[in-house]
């Protein structure tokens, strides 16, 4: 049982007996884990003649031979003479074909073929018997070899334990010789004393040749299950790990390939390598430059790290991430890049390794290979990038990667598109440079197209919608992005995603995107025409009923449905309706759906962000006289007055605005009292002149963005399990706290209010939100 490790010998172990080694590899008689061979193979031909496709007769050659052979003319006498010669030598020809070794030297036998390259019929018929004869000879030789080796092993074992180091060296050389033949190799591995002696000699010797031969012997034994077990039982693993410190390349190469075979096929080997300190040694070897050696070493690291957190941390402590990233940056050998990307993939799900890989430039290094012809390499790089992407939102120099990811959205490979969308979603989170870059390279169009192509494949639509949500808020190109979604025919499909069969995480993301799209006045009518408003109200009612039902049943804990809290849906839908309500026609539709009682009820919510969006939508609706009256009729004055004293300035300001708009038809003294009340409550902490307040708008922040992938080793990350849905209610650690300044394209000044002295200034000067006010749809998480 051999592995791809065989291939290492030719390239790496500088042996005197290279011919033997080459013939050994040419036989390809080993189990190949696929690292090095990777070759397209055909089934062996039963006739022993190789690939049947290559057996087509070349007719031009036949014709040529025909002309060549028979263009000369013979007399009858010559023909008879030749016939006679053939008849006389028939027996010899048969004997020559079947038993060539029985012929006398120098004996000439006339051939029946003019062209020596073609076998005669007799020779063809003799082929099976020759093959049988060779098989018998090989069997006899095998038995002889086995017998001789069995006889020699006790003596060789003794010699390996000799005091004289020269004798030990000679013994090591001879054992290595024997290990190259299959029969004697089996004899060696069946002797525990011999294998133990080899292991002991290998780790105790100071002689380069002895170390090379003993390591080479173990390498040869490691091609067989029996050999692997013998090495394992003889304590070979700690010895081989020790040899990883050898300054001699051939010893090093033998040691790593043998360990690789053990890790692949021997139970218990992984733990033994870890205990022997193999991980640290292997990481230290990553600065070597032989690509095939590095491919084996990185594959060993992958085997050891997969599913083992402690190993991942040891690799981190040994400087593994930096070394692995360097390999991805430096080399072009596909197998090495593939094995290295596999290690990085395994490490990328470890919360400690993740930032280390990112800081080492892992995102950029992995991005270099996204256009490689090797699909397995591209896929590994994408999986790894997706796992890392939530930790890479602050990285610089991502332009190239972002451009490539946008290109990959057009791929026909569904896995590629899924990963590209997921990575873009995370990289556009809280990073205005990345947002702008993606917009500039046609990201909006590509994402809209991706959503259109994806149909109901939520593993694609959800991250794509999240990416669009991020791109449509809080950066200089946001307004362009909001328009671009419409111009590329995205609005119908976006609204469609609010409907079944969409699940809650996708609905939540879509609601947030619609909220951002509504920031663009040109989208108001198309969104209304696509039926966004009734569906948002329907979702709001359903989610609110769900929260109420749980509250009435005595539940205090917010419950998740498909990883989404229903409170998030309430907040998101209300927030979207709030922005849509800037349009007079939309306000009519919203009011017509009997939403005011629900919005007033939401003012009583214990969640500040829900209070804020509810007050916000009421503020917009209250612009219309009938709506203001309806709000008052629903008993909103009491909760709104209460909210004036909220510690959340956004809530208090919206409440004040609604109360003010509701007072429009009230007597002058009522208005004056309200004005005083508003002034004292809103500016209780730092009174300032109304006209000194900045124009900060009513919107606090912009639509939410996610945290990323969280599970352990499996490469595929569901967006529903601890990933894209973790952006609610200001809970996430990566929230952007940028609320103190104006965000182009996101905020708007309130207009359309009557000139009422100080109160008008109040409307123009809504205070900035504090970090607690980050509604889930107003953050990039």
């Amino acid at each position: 049982m051999a592995t791809q490790a065989d291939l290492m010998e030719l390239d790496m172990a500088m042996e005197p007996d290279r011919k033997a080694a080459v013939s050994h590899w040419q036989q390809q008689s080993y189990l190949d884990s696929g690292i090095h061979s990777g070759a397209t193979t055909t089934a062996p031909s039963l006739s022993g003649k190789g690939n049947p496709e290559e057996e087509d007769v070349d007719t031009s050659q036949v014709l040529y031979e025909w002309e060549q052979g028979f263009s000369q003319s013979f007399t009858q006498e010559q023909v008879a003479d030749i016939d006679g010669q053939y008849a006389m030598t028939r027996a010899q020809r048969v004997r020559a074909a079947m038993f060539p070794e029985t012929l006398d030297e120098g004996m000439q036998i006339p051939s029946t073929q003019f062209d020596a390259a073609h076998p005669t019929n007799v020779q063809r018929l003799a082929e099976p018997s020759q093959m049988l004869k060779h098989a018998v000879v090989n069997l006899i030789n095998y038995q002889d070899d086995a017998e001789l080796a069995t006889r020699a092993i006790p003596e060789l074992t003794k010699l390996l334990n000799d005091e004289d180091q020269v004798v030990v060296n000679k013994a090591a050389v001879m054992v290595h010789q024997l290990s190259k033949k299959e029969a004697s190799r089996h004899a060696i591995m069946r002797s525990p004393q011999m294998v133990s002696a080899i292991v002991r000699t290998m780790q105790n010797t100071n002689d380069v040749e002895t170390a090379r031969c003993t390591a080479g012997t173990l390498h040869n034994l490691s091609h067989h299950r029996e050999g692997l077990l013998a090495i394992f039982k003889s304590g070979g693993i700690p010895a081989l790990v020790k040899m990883l410190g050898s300054p001699v390349d051939s010893v090093l190469f033998y040691a790593i390939t043998t360990l690789h075979n053990l890790l692949l096929h021997q139970e218990g080997a992984k733990m033994a390598v870890r205990l022997a300190g193999g991980l640290q040694k292997m990481v230290a070897l990553l600065n070597k430059t032989n690509v095939k050696f590095l491919a084996i070493t990185t594959d060993c690291l992958q085997i050891l790290a997969y599913g083992n957190q402690e190993s991942k941390l040891i690799i981190l402590a040994s400087g593994g991430p930096q070394a692995l990233v360097n390999i991805m940056r430096t080399y072009t050998y596909e197998k090495l890049l593939w094995t290295t990307s596999r290690v990085l993939k395994v490490l990328s799900v470890c919360s400690s390794n993740k930032p280390a890989i990112v800081e080492a430039g892992g995102m950029q290094a992995l991005g270099l290979h996204l256009t490689d012809p090797s699909q397995r390499l591209v896929q590994n790089c994408l999986w790894t990038l997706r796992n890392l992407s939530d930790a890479a939102t602050k990285q610089e120099g991502m332009e190239g990667l972002l451009g490539t990811l946008v290109q990959l959205l057009g791929s026909d490979d569904i896995n590629v598109v899924t990963c590209a969308a997921g990575i873009l979603s995370n990289l556009t989170c809280n990073n205005y440079k990345n947002k702008m870059m993606v917009c500039q390279v046609g990201g909006i169009e590509a994402l809209v197209r991706t959503v259109l192509r994806a149909g109901d494949r939520e593993d694609i639509t959800e991250p794509a919608i999240c990416a669009l949500r991020h791109l449509t808020s809080r950066h200089q190109e946001a307004e362009m992005a909001q328009n671009a979604v419409r111009l590329h025919y995205g609005l119908p499909v976006v609204v469609k995603l609010l409907h079944p069969p969409s699940h809650w995480p996708l609905i939540k993301a879509t609601v947030g995107l619609i909220r951002n799209l509504a920031l663009c006045p040109a989208n108001h009518a198309p969104l209304r025409e696509q039926g966004a408003i009734p569906r948002l109200v329907q979702l709001l009612v359903r989610a609110h009923q769900d929260t109420q039902r749980r509250t009435s049943m005595g539940g205090t804990q917010q419950q998740f449905v498909e990883g989404v809290r229903m409170e998030e849906i309430v907040e998101g839908c209300t927030g979207a309706l709030h922005i849509l309500a800037r349009d007079v026609h939309n306000r009519i539709v919203i009011r017509g759906l009997n939403t005011i009682p629900l919005f007033v009820q939401l003012l009583y919510s214990p969640i500040e962000n829900i209070q804020r969006v509810a007050a916000g939508v009421l503020c917009e609706l209250a612009q219309d006289k009938e709506a203001a009256e309806a709000i008052e009729a629903e008993g909103a004055t009491a909760p709104l007055t209460e909210l004036l004293h909220s510690r959340n300035e956004g809530v208090a300001t919206y409440a004040a605005a609604v109360l003010f708009r509701m007072s429009e038809d009230k007597p002058q003294d009522y208005k004056k009292r309200l004005s005083v009340e508003l002034t004292s409550s809103l500016f209780r902490t730092e009174p300032m002149a109304w006209n000194e307040t900045a124009d900060l708008g009513l919107d606090i922040g912009a639509q939410g963005e996610p945290l990323g992938y969280r599970q352990d080793d499996p490469s595929y990350r569901s967006f529903h399990s601890g990933g894209y849905g973790q952006d609610a209610l200001g809970m996430d650690p990566m929230m952007e706290h940028e609320m103190g300044g104006h965000h182009p394209g996101a905020d708007y000044p309130v207009d359309g209010l009557p000139d009422l002295g100080h109160a008008q200034d109040l409307m123009d000067g809504l205070p900035p939100g504090d970090s607690n006010q980050l509604a889930w749809f107003d953050t990039d998480l």
Partner: nanobody, 123 residues
Framework: QVQLVESGGGLVQAGGSLRLSCAAS????????LGWFRQAPGKEREFVSV????????YYADSLKGRFTISRDNAKSTVYLQMNSLKPEDTALYYC????????????????WGQGTQVTVSS
Amino acid sequence: QVQLVESGGGLVQAGGSLRLSCAASGVSFSRTSLGWFRQAPGKEREFVSVISWIGGTTYYADSLKGRFTISRDNAKSTVYLQMNSLKPEDTALYYCAISNGVLPRTEGAFASWGQGTQVTVSS
């Protein structure tokens, strides 16, 4: 019946060279180890060199300091001993011996012996 016949001995001046041969018969030559011993007048027989049946591995007595080289030709069933930079103290009767051992170095490990060939080195 195993037979070993040595040849190539003779008289040579100090610093000169000789090549001894030992032809074997009646034995599966390629599966045996062959050695050379020598016996100086009035002294015990001493080990000179051995060549193993495994990969032609060789071993020499420490005293030879790289002056002698043992080799074998399995096709001719013959073992050779190339002696260079000969010294008067190399004068001895040189014996060829055969063994089934892996790397035999003592007399007892060899089963069959030749009659020997005389080497005399004059000063």
